[in-house]
C-alpha cells in the first residue's frame, strides 16, 4: 500500500481540532487494517504509541487521546485515513505515523508520517533584571515566557520619554530575550518593557529600572 | 484463463428491481476485490459498486447508493448485484470486472444489458 | 468526487501514425491511473495501471506518463487493431472515475 501524506509540517491553534491527512490506494480487502501511533517530539519513531486502530470493520481509539481522535471517513476504506483530533493541547505537538496494511498489498511499507505543531500563544513572560546599576555599571534586563509555539521573540521597549542612548548601550537579543544595557546613566534610569511575540499573539511584562550613583545602595 | 460471465440482464420497469450475477472462473475468486461497472448506450463507463475480498466492505457512488446492493458467494465463486428502484438512468450494460492489487480493473465479462423503460 | 477530463474526444489517424491521448485529473492522483481500450460490442481491456505499468501481453507501441494531474497514452506506431475507444480512469480514492473517452478512428 503507497500511503500519501502532506509534505509540509501542519499547525494547528490550541483548542481547535486538527485534520491530519492521510491518503492511500489499494483494493481493501477484508484483511485491511489502518493504524496511527504517536511520537513525541525528540523521540525515534520506535518509540511510538498508538492512539487509533482500525481492523475487521471496527474503530478502537487508544491511549490518553482517545476521547479526541476520531476519522474523517468511518470506515477508513475509500482511500482516506484522515485522523481529526479535537480540541488540540500542547502535549498533542509531535509526529503522527499513519500506517495502512493491505495484504496482499505489500508493494510499499504503507506509512506516512506528519509532524504536528500545536500553536500556542506566548504566555505572560517573567521580567527580571541582574547586574550593577550604578552610574558606570552594566545591567542585564531578561525576559521570558514559559509557554509558546513557535517561541516567542522578545522585544525590549523604554516607556516614556528620554535621550536616545548611544549606540552600543543598549543590545538586544531577540531570540534570548535579553536585553543588556552598559555604560548606564541616570538618564538610564526608567521603565522597561518586554514583548513576547509569535503568530498567535502577544504578551508583555515591565521592569522599572533605577539608576544610583556609585556611593548609593542598588534599588531595582 | 480468467472468465466473468455475467447474467440476468434485461427489460423492467421505472421503479421494478433486478438481480445481476457473474459467475467467476481461472482465478482465486475469494482472494479478490470485485466491481460492477456500467456503461449507458453510446457513452462512458461508470463504476457502481465494488466488494472486497471476503465481502466484508462495499463501495457505491452516490448516484447508485441506497438502490443497488453488491454481495458475494465465495464457496460459488459467484458476484451479484441486487438494483432496486430502477430508473431510466440505470438504463446500460452492466460488466462484473476483477479489481488488481490496486482498485484498476484487471479482467471484465462480456456484460449484460439492463433496459428500464415502461 | 475528481472528475477525468480526456482530449481529444475524436482523433483521426493512420496506421504507422504516433498517437497521443491526453487526461487530466481534477486534482492530483499522483500516479493512480489506469488506460483502458474498447471496441465496439465488446468489453474494456485494460491497457495500463499506475501511470506507466504494462500488463503481461499489452503490445510495448503503447505507452503511459504523467503524475499529479497530467496524463498521457501514447501509440507509437498506430495499428489497423488500434482503431477504438480509449479511456482514463483513476485509481486513487473512491469513488473511482473515467474519463468520457477518445476514440480513435481511421483518417
Known amino acids: 500500500v503507497e500511503v500519501k501524506v502532506p509534505t509540509e509540517p501542519l499547525s494547528t491553534p490550541l483548542g481547535k481540532t486538527a485534520e491530519l491527512t492521510c491518503t492511500y490506494s489499494t483494493s481493501v480487502g477484508d484483511s485491511f487494517a489502518l493504524e496511527w501511533s504517536f511520537v513525541q517530539p525528540g523521540k525515534p519513531i520506535s518509540e511510538s504509541h498508538p492512539i487509533l486502530y482500525f481492523t475487521n470493520g471496527h474503530l478502537y481509539p487508544t491511549g490518553s487521546k482517545s476521547k479526541r481522535v476520531s476519522l474523517l471517513q468511518n470506515p477508513p476504506t475509500v482511500g482516506v485515513a484522515t485522523l481529526k483530533l479535537t480540541d488540540v493541547h500542547p502535549s498533542d505537538t509531535g509526529t503522527y505515523l499513519c500506517q495502512v496494511n493491505n495484504p496482499p498489498d505489500f508493494y510499499t511499507n504503507g506509512l506516512g508520517l506528519i509532524n504536528l505543531t500545536v500553536l500556542v500563544p506566548p504566555s505572560n513572560p517573567l521580567c527580571s533584571q541582574s547586574g550593577q546599576t550604578s552610574v558606570g555599571g552594566s545591567t542585564a534586563l531578561r525576559c521570558s515566557s514559559s509557554e509558546g509555539a513557535p517561541k516567542p521573540v522578545y522585544n525590549w521597549v523604554r516607556l516614556g520619554t528620554f535621550p536616545t542612548p548611544s549606540p552600543g548601550s543598549m543590545v538586544q537579543d531577540e531570540v534570548s530575550g535579553q536585553l543588556i544595557l552598559t555604560n548606564l546613566s541616570l538618564t538610564s534610569s526608567g521603565t522597561y518593557r518586554c514583548v513576547a511575540t509569535n503568530q498567535m499573539g502577544s504578551a508583555s511584562c515591565e521592569l522599572t529600572l533605577s539608576v544610583t550613583e556609585p556611593s548609593q545602595g542598588r534599588v531595582a | 484463463q480468467v472468465q466473468l460471465v455475467e447474467s440476468g440482464g434485461g427489460l423492467v420497469k421505472p421503479g421494478g428491481s433486478l438481480r445481476l450475477s457473474c459467475a467467476a472462473s481461472?482465478?482465486?475468486?475469494?482472494?479478490?476485490?470485485m466491481s460492477w461497472i456500467r456503461q449507458a448506450p453510446g457513452k462512458g463507463l461508470e463504476w457502481v459498486a465494488s466488494i472486497s475480498d471476503g465481502g466484508l466492505y462495499t463501495h457505491y457512488p452516490d448516484s447508485v447508493k441506497g438502490r443497488f446492493t453488491i454481495s458475494r458467494d465465495n464457496a460459488k465463486s459467484s458476484l451479484y448485484l441486487q438494483m432496486n428502484s430502477l430508473r431510466a438512468e440505470d438504463t446500460a450494460v452492466y460488466y462484473c470486472?476483477?479489481?488488481?492489487?490496486?482498485?484498476?480493473?484487471?479482467?471484465w465479462g462480456q456484460g449484460t444489458l439492463v433496459t428500464v423503460s415502461s | 468526487d475528481i472528475q477525468m477530463t480526456q482530449s481529444p474526444s475524436t482523433l483521426s489517424a493512420s496506421v504507422g501514425d504516433r498517437v497521443t491521448i491526453t487526461c487530466r485529473a481534477s486534482e492530483n492522483i499522483y500516479s493512480y491511473l489506469a488506460w483502458y481500450q474498447q471496441k465496439p460490442g465488446k468489453a474494456p481491456k485494460l491497457l495500463i495501471y499506475?501511470?506507466?505499468t504494462l500488463p503481461e501481453g499489452v503490445p510495448s507501441r503503447f505507452s503511459g506518463s504523467g503524475s499529479g494531474t497530467e496524463f498521457t497514452l501514447t501509440i507509437s506506431s498506430l495499428q489497423p487493431d488500434d482503431f477504438a475507444t480509449y479511456y482514463c480512469q483513476h485509481h486513487y480514492v473512491i469513488p473511482w472515475t473515467f474519463g468520457q473517452g477518445t476514440k480513435v478512428e481511421i483518417k
Open positions: 470486472a476483477r479489481q488488481g492489487v490496486r482498485p484498476f480493473f484487471d479482467y
Open positions: 499506475n501511470a506507466e
Open positions: 481461472g482465478f482465486t475468486f475469494s482472494n479478490s476485490g
